[in-house]
Amino acid sequence: EVEKTACPSGKKAREIDESLIFYKKWELEACVDAALLATQMDRVNAIPFTYEQLDVLKHKLDELYPQGYPESVIQHLGYLFLKMSPEDIRKWNVTSLETLKALLEVNKGHEMSPQVATLIDRFVKGRGQLDKDTLDTLTAFYPGYLCSLSPEELSSVPPSSIWAVRPQDLDTCDPRQLDVLYPKARLAFQNMNGSEYFVKIQSFLGGAPTEDLKALSQQNVSMDLATFMKLRTDAVLPLTVAEVQKLLGPHVEGLKAEERHRPVRDWILRQRQDDLDTLGLGLQG
């Protein structure tokens, strides 16, 4: 908390500009008018304020708007957004998609923070619904958000949202969601070459049908066991021992450790013992 002190003569801020970076915390508190700051918020991000100075600026806005910032200020918060707590954000009423995009941009590349999660909640409450533009925005910034959507909602997700997905983003997607996402991913990545294609499609293979797994087995992809374990059981069951061996490549030895777990367990039970013996892993059908 900065003490209330009078502003030194000649230091009263007439506008938000670079000269303010040389102000001490108490000088910012004393010499920057909160209303001026609110109207010139868009300038703050162009100025290399320290974290401590940003704390002072936030404090000034908090005093000016104890019930929560207006959207005109929120839209221009920029990096000051990272200073906001979920409690601060719960006071906001955010209805503009441009405001949402501006703040998501600040947090881009990071895990969905409690601040962002609260912002999304406020936005949905402010809008009353999640329309297609909002869903497209959220999934573009946070591809993991796809896993919060129903298969029906996922059916309208554009292929462009698929491009940004990283493997960890789909960790919480269930089989029915992957059933919807897999064909979209296949379409999105169709022009990539073999090894690049496999790297991109790998996360979505929990929705792949048998015929696609058979095709992959002919491409020396060396699928890891973690991916194999996420495949649909009904898609794995028709695969022959030879096809699974080709699909897994050097990782085939990992089947032994997973022999009690689906889909490996169910697949083993479908194979002839003679065929299983060719793997030399001691698998018992």
Partner: nanobody, 113 residues
């Protein structure tokens, strides 16, 4: 900070019922889907059920006729009602906000024969 806390686990006889709860703090559940997973000793984690942002639901095959997932956004809580429990349902059950790394520590469910 975001915290999820499960409760409602315990020891129950085969054929019995339990209702698990998952309470969220630090974030509102309403824009997100919530999922339940379970992990038996020595096994991988196994997805049980999800309730999406829209309120529609989905279940793993073993859970379809016996388990029911629901949510109460006003209480920031998700539930898993488990009926006709079997010994093979014995596991630690935990909830997670779909699409995020936010998950609870889990609650132990033990079904005796």
């Amino acid at each position: 900070d975001v915290q999820l806390q499960e409760s409602g686990g315990g020891l129950v006889q085969a054929g019995g019922s339990l209702r698990l709860s998952c309470v969220g703090a630090g974030v509102s559940f309403s824009p997100y889907g919530i999922g339940w997973w379970r992990q038996a000793q020595g096994n991988q984690r196994e997805w049980v059920a999800s309730i999406y942002r829209s309120g529609s639901t989905n279940y793993e095959d073993f859970a379809k006729d016996r388990f029911t997932i629901s949510r109460d956004n006003t209480k920031n809580t998700a539930y898993l009602q488990m009926n006709s429990l079997k010994p093979e349902d014995t596991a630690v059950y935990y909830c997670q906000i779909l699409g995020t790394s936010y998950r609870g520590q889990g609650t132990q469910v033990t079904v005796s024969s």
